[in-house]
C-alpha cells in the first residue's frame, strides 16, 4: 500500500532508502530541456516476489527543444554537474541491498535524468537521514523514518535529528526541544494496530550507519 505522503523534511538534511520495497514507484523525470518519451512510462516500479525483485519499466528522456515550454530549456549549472555514482561499496555498508527479500536496489541512472529522484514509497519503507555538508547532527534518537499504517491511514514517524551549522553556537543535545510526532501524538501512543513490515531488521544498523549510504544525493 502506498504511503499517502512524503517522508518528513528535516532542515539541512537529506534522506535515503537503502533498499526499496515492492510496489515503490520512481517517477521518470527528466532534466531541464528534456522530457519523457511519448510512449514512455510514467514511472519505474519495484516489482517481483520474495526471492527476486527488480525495477519494471525503463525511464527514457528525449530532447524537448522542438516543444514549447514556458521557461528556457537551457540546463541549469546544478543540472550540468555529473551525478554521483549510485554504487555503495564502503566497507561500512551495513546490509547488502540485494540480500533483502522483496526489495529492489537503487536503480541505475538513465540518460538525461533529473537531478532529484521522486519516489512514491509503500508502507513499511524506512528512510535514513543525514545532515548535508556543513551541518552536524544532534541526535535525540534514530535518524530514520518509517511509513506506518495507523487507524487505516499512513504516516511517517518523525526522525529524531537536528542539523546545526558547524560554526553556530547551538544548544547541547540535552537542551533540545522535544520534536512532536505527526498529529501531535507521542510515538508510544498506539492504541490501535500499527502495521510495519520486515524493515525491523534494519533498525540496528542505523546507529552504525556511515556517510557511505548517502553517496548519491538527488538534490
Amino acid at each position: 500500500e502506498l504511503c499517502d505522503d512524503d517522508p518528513p523534511e528535516i532542515p539541512h538534511a537529506t534522506f535515503k532508502a537503502m533498499a526499496y520495497k515492492e510496489g515503490t514507484m520512481l517517477n521518470c523525470e527528466c532534466k531541464r530541456g528534456f522530457r519523457r518519451i511519448k510512449s514512455g512510462s510514467l514511472y519505474m516500479l519495484c516489482t517481483g516476489n520474495s526471492s527476486h525483485s527488480s525495477w519494471d519499466n525503463q525511464c527514457q528522456c528525449t530532447s524537448s527543444a522542438t516543444r514549447n515550454t514556458t521557461k528556457q530549456v537551457t540546463p541549469q549549472p546544478e543540472e550540468q554537474k555529473e551525478r554521483k555514482t549510485t554504487e555503495m561499496q564502503s566497507p561500512m555498508q551495513p546490509v547488502d541491498q540485494a540480500s533483502l527479500p522483496g526489495h529492489c536496489r537503487e536503480p541505475p541512472p538513465w540518460e538525461n535524468e533529473a537531478t532529484e529522484r521522486i519516489y512514491h514509497f509503500v508502507v513499511g519503507q524506512m528512510v535514513y537521514y543525514q545532515c548535508v555538508q556543513g551541518y552536524r547532527a544532534l541526535h535525540r534518537g534514530p535518524a530514520e523514518s518509517v511509513c506506518k499504517m495507523t487507524h487505516g491511514k499512513t504516516r511517517w514517524t518523525q526522525p529524531q535529528l537536528i542539523c546545526t551549522g558547524e560554526m553556530e553556537t547551538s544548544q547541547f543535545p540535552g537542551e533540545e526541544k522535544p520534536q512532536a510526532s505527526p498529529e501531535g501524538r507521542p510515538e508510544s501512543e498506539t492504541s490501535c494496530l500499527v502495521t510495519t513490515t520486515d524493515f525491523q531488521i534494519q533498525t540496528e544498523m542505523a546507529a552504525t550507519m556511515e556517510t557511505s549510504i548517502f553517496t548519491t544525493e538527488y538534490q
Epitope: K38, S39, T69
Partner: antibody, heavy 114, light 107 residues
Framework: QIQLQQSGAELVRPGTSVKMSCKAA????????IGWVKQRPGHGLEWIGD????????NYNENFKGKATFTADTSSSTTYMQLSSLTSEDSAIYFC???????WGQGTPVTVSS | DIVLTQSQKFMSTSVGDRVSVTCKAS??????VAWYQQKPGQSPKALIY???YRYSGVPDRFTGSGSGTDFTLTISNVQSEDLAEYFC?????????FGGGTKLEIK
C-alpha cells in the same frame, strides 16, 4: 494531509473563456505533475494534459491543443487551466489530479450557456 | 491513441458476491494500468496502480490483475458501499486514456 482544492462552479457564455484553479497542499508542489481531466455525462473521462509546476513543462492531448492552457504559480502552490472559445461541448466537470493520479480535486463544474 | 474498452457498461451483483470488471487495451500497455472508483457526485478515487497494487486505505476485497492488453478488477464479498462506476486507465503512453466505465449495481 494532501489536498487538491479546486475553484467553484462556472456559468459562462459561448465564445468566452474561463480560468479555473487547483490549489495543492500537504506535499512539495514543485515535485509532481498536475494533470487535468474532463468528465461529461455519457462521455466518460478524458485526459486533457498535464503540467510540471517545477519547470512549467506541459503536455497536451492533441484534442485539447488550442482549447486548454495550463499555468502554475509556485508561490501559491496553485495550477490554473484556461479554456478558450467555449462551446456547449465544453460543458463538463473538470478535475485536477496529482501524484501519479493518486489524488484528485473535487472538480469544477463548467456550464456554457447563452 | 490507445483505446481502453470496458465492454460491460452495467453489472448487477448482490452483497457478498464476487464480481469482475474487465478492461481491454487496443495495444500492449504492460502493467501501466490504474483502476478508479467513482460514486455519484464525487471525484474518482484511485484504487489500483500498476495493474495489481492497491493504494492505501483500499479494502483488500479489491484486487487488480492482468498485463499486456487484458486487465481485470475483481471485487470479492461485494458491499453496498461498492455501488459506483469503475474506470480503467492506461498511462503507458501519451495521451493517457480511460475506459468508458462500468456501473456496478447492487441488487
Amino acid at each position: 494531509q494532501i489536498q487538491l482544492q479546486q475553484s467553484g462552479a462556472e456559468l459562462v457564455r459561448p465564445g468566452t473563456s474561463v480560468k479555473m484553479s487547483c490549489k495543492a497542499a500537504g506535499y512539495t508542489f514543485t515535485n509532481y505533475w498536475i494533470g487535468w481531466v474532463k468528465q461529461r455525462p455519457g462521455h466518460g473521462l478524458e485526459w486533457i494534459g498535464d503540467i510540471h509546476p517545477g519547470g512549467s513543462y506541459t503536455n497536451y492531448n492533441e484534442n485539447f491543443k488550442g482549447k486548454a492552457t495550463f499555468t502554475a504559480d509556485t508561490s501559491s502552490s496553485t495550477t490554473y487551466m484556461q479554456l478558450s472559445s467555449l462551446t456547449s461541448e465544453d460543458s463538463a466537470i473538470y478535475f485536477c489530479t496529482s501524484r501519479n493520479f493518486a489524488k484528485w480535486g473535487q472538480g469544477t463544474p463548467v456550464t456554457v450557456s447563452s | 491513441d490507445i483505446v481502453l474498452t470496458q465492454s460491460q457498461k452495467f453489472m448487477s451483483t448482490s452483497v457478498g458476491d464476487r464480481v469482475s470488471v474487465t478492461c481491454k487495451a487496443s495495444q500492449n500497455v504492460g502493467t501501466n494500468v490504474a483502476w478508479y472508483q467513482q460514486k455519484p457526485g464525487q471525484s474518482p478515487k484511485a484504487l489500483i496502480y500498476s495493474a495489481s497494487y492497491r493504494y492505501s486505505g483500499v479494502p483488500d476485497r479489491f484486487t487488480g490483475s492482468g498485463s499486456g492488453t487484458d486487465f481485470t478488477l475483481t471485487i470479492s464479498n461485494v458491499q453496498s458501499e461498492d455501488l459506483a462506476e469503475y474506470f480503467c486507465q492506461q498511462y503507458n503512453s501519451y495521451p493517457y486514456t480511460f475506459g468508458g466505465g462500468t456501473k456496478l449495481e447492487i441488487k
